[in-house]
Amino acid sequence: SELDTPKDLQVSETAETSLTLLWKTPLAKFDRYRLNYSLPTGQWVGVQLPRNTTSYVLRGLEPGQEYNVLLTAEKGRHKSKPARVKASTEQAPELENLTVTEVGWDGLRLNWTAADQAYEHFIIQVQEANKVEAARNLTVPGSLRAVDIPGLKAATPYTVSIYGVIQGYRTPVLSAEASTGETPNLGEVVVAEVGWDALKLNWTAPEGAYEYFFIQVQEADTVEAAQNLTVPGGLRSTDLPGLKAATHYTITIRGVTQDFSTTPLSVEVLTEEVPDMGNLTVTEVSWDALRLNWTTPDGTYDQFTIQVQEADQVEEAHNLTVPGSLRSMEIPGLRAGTPYTVTLHGEVRGHSTRPLAVEVVTEDLPQLGDLAVSEVGWDGLRLNWTAADNAYEHFVIQVQEVNKVEAAQNLTLPGSLRAVDIPGLEAATPYRVSIYGVIRGYRTPVLSAEASTAKEPEIGNLNVSDITPESFNLSWMATDGIFETFTIEIIDSNRLLETVEYNISGAERTAHISGLPPSTDFIVYLSGLAPSIRTKTISATATTEALPLLENLTISDINPYGFTVSWMASENAFDSFLVTVVDSGKLLDPQEFTLSGTQRKLELRGLITGIGYEVMVSGFTQGHQTKPLRAEIVTEAMGSPKEVIFSDITENSATVSWRAPTAQVESFRITYVPITGGTPSMVTVDGTKTQTRLVKLIPGVEYLVSIIAMKGFEESEPVSGSFTTA
């Protein structure tokens, strides 16, 4: 019997290079399937499949082609009628728009368009247009749409082609043509600066063309190895240090990329001579010194050695060593009117340069001039004269009384002086003074002048003024400009105190004497001390005033928040009072109150309850402060009861009421007594009470009642009042 045809043969999935087939198994028994499908070329391909197969994928097909498929069941030599189906593969996505977007001298950039996520990879072929030599192949991922093709020859035409690969299938090839650009060249190279051990090289080049520049520095005419340097491609200038002085160099520069180096540019240069010290000059010349100046680059030498030699003399030269930072030097100690040769050596770590030399003649000796007597005293004179600076070793001055032939007085003075005081002369006497200078044993001509001393100095008119309890002022008269000091002695008339002595400047004509006891008689002695003389002593008397009285510091009306301070003082004795309140623990800032000299009490409020205070009161008179009076007080002390009121008064009784103080108290004690006298009666009530009944009184008698608050051992100030029984 005939075999059943496979049932329901159909194409379930189509792709660009595959078709998926499905079918159902026939009822009759069979051994296998035979699957045949046609290729676009007309050929047929056959595949044998196991009997249990119900699907199959045809792979490796071409996109966009129609395929005929026949499926037959076979048993032995028997075949069923074929099941047939026709299907087409999907159209392949297009690869298009191949363009060369950037052209460099050694590479190109390719761009193309293609469907997204379609391709496994692209194959790009690059070939010189006019050459048959092997093309260069590049495989790039299917996700790319552009690629750089480096490593090409400059100024060369290229053919570039591309195809995509999809599951082994190649798309049609796209091609494009492009030529690479001309090789970029270095521009010009110049030596911008030349030194003796370095130079600066500048060059031009296209921006971004080179990764780096390779510079070679070669000594001309030597086989010595060149000095090589590489500098970044962004630079157009570099310093070349460490060269030899006065040497010919050939410098070459190349631009370098990964696989290309430009033709080198060269430049020749001669470095400068080593900078020697130069311009040794003498800028200032005096009779015994000169100033040298010289030039040299900074940092060249550690130090300089200067040699100073008298010309035409064989005696040893004078050597000086100075720091390498100096460019100038003063050479002192030379002879006047003398030719010198000065040489200068530079030095580096002990190595000495060849010398520079200069010749110079010092000036002639200076002269003294203008001797004058500028000040005349009673026992001395002041001389002034002029002379060249730093010229003289010393001066010799001779002083002689004009009308006497006795030996003259000689003085030797340092050469730096231009004035001197001549002491120890007689008052009101004419003198002749002469002077000469000495320079290394040589004496200048003598200069002379005449002058008379003044009369002897005097003091007088010793006055006492501005007497206070502890001080007074002195004033006196004295000859001006003579006295060095005045001595003042203060002695009390009763000789109970030690003598006090003051030495004060001779320029003063007043003195303030303080620190004296009040109400004391003093004798003041004054004498003046001038060079070689003490004047006769003059005297005056003085009595210090009595000290104003400040006494009886009293604290009253103590309550939790304050108290009243009062004191006694002499009338009109004080300008002001200072009251200072300090807590005993010194935890708070002191409070100061300045009161006028007429006040005698101060009410203090706003203090802290339950702490101790120290109160100090001092008086001020003419700026002087008395020693303070002191008292201590505690604000916890009881506040006094207030506002005593009497009511319900009968012949032998009455009710007394009061207002309790702010702070809590334990009890109140009420004392009452007839005003005319007698034994006081007393009653104590609980601290919470504010009234009590007074009984057993005498009719028609005035009673004085006083109430105090009590707490422990403390008692308040009393509050009082009076009433009369009926």
Epitope: D197, E273, G299, T300, V348, R349, H351, S352, R354
Partner: antibody, heavy 118, light 108 residues
Framework: EVQLLESGGGLVQPGGSLRLSCAAS????????MSWVRQAPGKGLEWVSA????????YYADSVKGRFTISKDNSKNTLYLQMNSLRAEDTAVYYC???????????WGQGTLVTVSS | SSELTQDPAVSVALGQTVRVTCQGD??????ASWYQQKPGQAPVLVIY???NRPSGIPDRFSGSSSGNTASLTITGAQAEDEADYYC??????????FGGGTKLTVLS
């Protein structure tokens, strides 16, 4: 009497480090510049490095620049040469020498041998 | 190569005068210093500056300078003068430079 005594030489592998010391006596160490000079076996003298009296200025030969460091401790009267990244061509006797004003390299130590070899 | 150039070897008959020379650019500006080194010993300064001898150096040693050349002269060479002689100066970068050295042989 001026005395200079080098120490710290020895055998070291290429790329290794060594520190030479030079103990000085008989002069005010802080007032004088000092130098290191080396001499390869059978070869001439080669200046290596110098330092000013205070230690504030240092100088190096191109062949050792960046690898060697000269220093001095004036409180210990000692000169040092720290040698890093040593090469076979650094093999030499290393001398320390004193410099006086106007007198270069006036006193030398007896030297210490440094051998750089694998 | 060294910045100071010396003849590698010089010989002199005992008692005769010999001159050892040293050439280099830095000698136009600086005086050379001269060092004597005997085998196995440290160098010893023999001449510095224009023509100065440290104490203990015999007066048969002298120095001179002209242009870019410095000379060490030994007048009446002695057997103990046989040694290597090195010249030394300062270059433009303030670094010390030594000549390659001259081996002096005294022939008896």
């Amino acid at each position: 009497e001026v005395q200079l005594l080098e120490s710290g030489g020895g055998l070291v592998q290429p790329g290794g480090s060594l520190r030479l010391s030079c103990a000085a006596s008989g002069f005010t160490f802080s007032s004088y510049a000092m130098s290191w000079v080396r001499q390869a076996p059978g070869k001439g003298l080669e200046w290596v490095s110098a330092i000013s009296g205070s230690g504030g200025s240092t100088y190096y030969a191109d062949s050792v620049k960046g690898r060697f460091t000269i220093s001095k401790d004036n409180s210990k009267n000692t000169l040092y040469l720290q040698m890093n990244s040593l090469r076979a061509e650094d093999t030499a006797v290393y001398y320390c020498a004193k410099t006086s004003p106007r007198v270069p390299l006036d006193y030398w130590g007896q030297g210490t041998l440094v051998t750089v070899s694998s | 190569s060294s910045e100071l150039t010396q003849d590698p070897a010089v010989s002199v008959a005992l008692g005769q005068t010999v001159r050892v020379t040293c050439q280099g650019d830095s000698l136009r500006s600086y005086y050379a210093s001269w060092y004597q080194q005997k085998p196995g010993q440290a160098p010893v300064l023999v001449i510095y500056g224009k023509n100065n001898r440290p104490s203990g150096i015999p007066d048969r040693f002298s120095g001179s300078s002209s242009g870019n050349t410095a000379s060490l002269t030994i007048t009446g060479a002695q057997a103990e003068d046989e040694a290597d002689y090195y010249c030394n100066s300062i270059n433009s970068t303030r670094n010390e430079v030594f000549g390659g050295g001259t081996k002096l042989t005294v022939l008896s």
